[in-house]
């Protein structure tokens, strides 16, 4: 996740539990990871200056047959206001950078935490 600035509105406001549940799921994935996540699949790194939920979904939706991230994909799909399909590409991606799904999940989790920490823990 190459850009951690500017937190634009993610569209329709998800329920109050949304972010907590997403963080919990990402924590579960990172903690329970034994073999390479999604067989080491690579996804586009994303630019978080725009709608984070849709950007993350556009990247992760291209990973199929990976049960470990299916819940995350469903959550992001519920938070993103427009329909996202595999192969879709927008300016939200950093075109020349691909990273492993495991790193993508870890970076997304760190970014979500950072949203609330600034000024509080630094």
């Amino acid at each position: 996740l190459t850009c951690l600035g500017g937190f634009a509105s993610p569209g329709p406001v998800p329920p109050s539990t949304a972010l907590r549940e997403l963080i919990e799921e990402l924590v579960n994935i990172t903690q329970n990871q034994k073999a390479p996540l999604c067989n080491g699949s690579m996804v586009w790194s994303i630019n978080l200056t725009a709608g984070m939920y849709c950007a993350a979904l556009e990247s992760l939706i291209n990973v199929s047959g990976c049960s470990a991230i299916e819940k995350t994909q469903r959550m992001l799909s519920g938070f993103c206001p427009h329909k996202v399909s595999a192969g879709q590409f927008s300016s939200l991606h950093v075109r020349d950078t691909k990273i492993e799904v495991a790193q993508f999940v870890k970076d997304l989790l760190l970014h979500l935490k950072k949203l609330f920490r600034e000024g509080q823990f630094n």
Epitope: F7, L19, R20, V27, T30, L110, K113, L115, G119, Q120
Partner: antibody, heavy 111, light 112 residues
Framework: EVQLVESGGGLVKPGGSLKLSCAAS????????MSWVRQTPEKRLEWVAG????????YYPETMKGRFTISRDNARNTLYLQMSSLRSEDTAIYYC????WGQGTSVTVSS | DVVLTQTPLTLSVTIGQPASISCKSS???????????LNWLLQRPGQSPKRLIY???KLDSGVPDRFTGSGSGTDFTLKISRVEAEDLGVYYC?????????FGGGTKLEIK
């Protein structure tokens, strides 16, 4: 100097609602995440809610049971906490925090 | 949720003497970005909490250097090299590595 001034607390009946405000000054409010933390009569501290700098992202610990809503108005440099379906266990001093802490506003839920 | 256990509950210290407070976490507070998000707060009698230390050992501006934060993983310590009268109050540790953020139960520092 960072200043956070909370207001809106008071005595409310169980099941009632209250909206707390926090007026911020002395820093660029719109560039910082903000939180509400409460201190129970037993002096225990609990994180109530957090909100990102732009206001798009909010976090509530599961213990808050969806009865609270945090929001902010960056044009007015003000943080809010809307509290509904209040219970006696919500009785506490509520602090607005961003590294620095406000003086707090007292909320008492009692019939 | 992460549990922070502070010891002792109460600490009685003579002015000019050192003091030490422990904060133990039920999980490591080292995050995957290499940072450890642990704060120390002081709540003086009748006042709101004030942050003294962040990121384990960094002193907030205006905090005297007699305060020192240290530790890693699950074990953290706040030390006061020479206690002064203005140091009395309740000290809390606060972690921001794991969500939800949680606080220790507090340690009351009394002056003998």
């Amino acid at each position: 100097e960072v200043q956070l001034v909370e207001s809106g607390g008071g005595l409310v009946k169980p099941g009632g609602s209250l909206k707390l405000s926090c007026a911020a000054s002395g820093f660029t409010f719109s560039t910082y995440a903000m939180s509400w933390v409460r201190q129970t009569p037993e002096k225990r501290l609990e994180w109530v809610a957090g909100i990102s700098s732009g206001g798009s992202y909010t976090y509530y610990p599961e213990t808050m049971k969806g009865r609270f809503t945090i929001s902010r108005d960056n044009a007015r440099n003000t943080l809010y906490l809307q509290m509904s379906s209040l219970r006696s266990e919500d009785t506490a001093i509520y602090y607005c925090t961003r590294g620095s802490w406000g003086q707090g506003t007292s909320v008492t839920v009692s019939s | 949720d992460v549990v922070l256990t502070q010891t002792p509950l109460t600490l009685s210290v003579t002015i000019g003497q050192p003091a030490s407070i422990s904060c133990k976490s039920s999980q490591s507070l080292l995050d995957s970005d290499g940072e450890t998000y642990l704060n120390w707060l002081l709540q003086r009698p009748g006042q709101s909490p004030k942050r003294l230390i962040y990121l384990v050992s960094k002193l907030d501006s205006g905090v005297p250097d007699r305060f020192t934060g240290s530790g890693s993983g699950t074990d953290f310590t706040l030390k006061i090299s020479r206690v002064e009268a203005e140091d009395l109050g309740v000290y809390y540790c606060w972690q921001g590595t794991h969500f939800p953020w949680t606080f220790g139960g507090g340690t009351k520092l009394e002056i003998k």
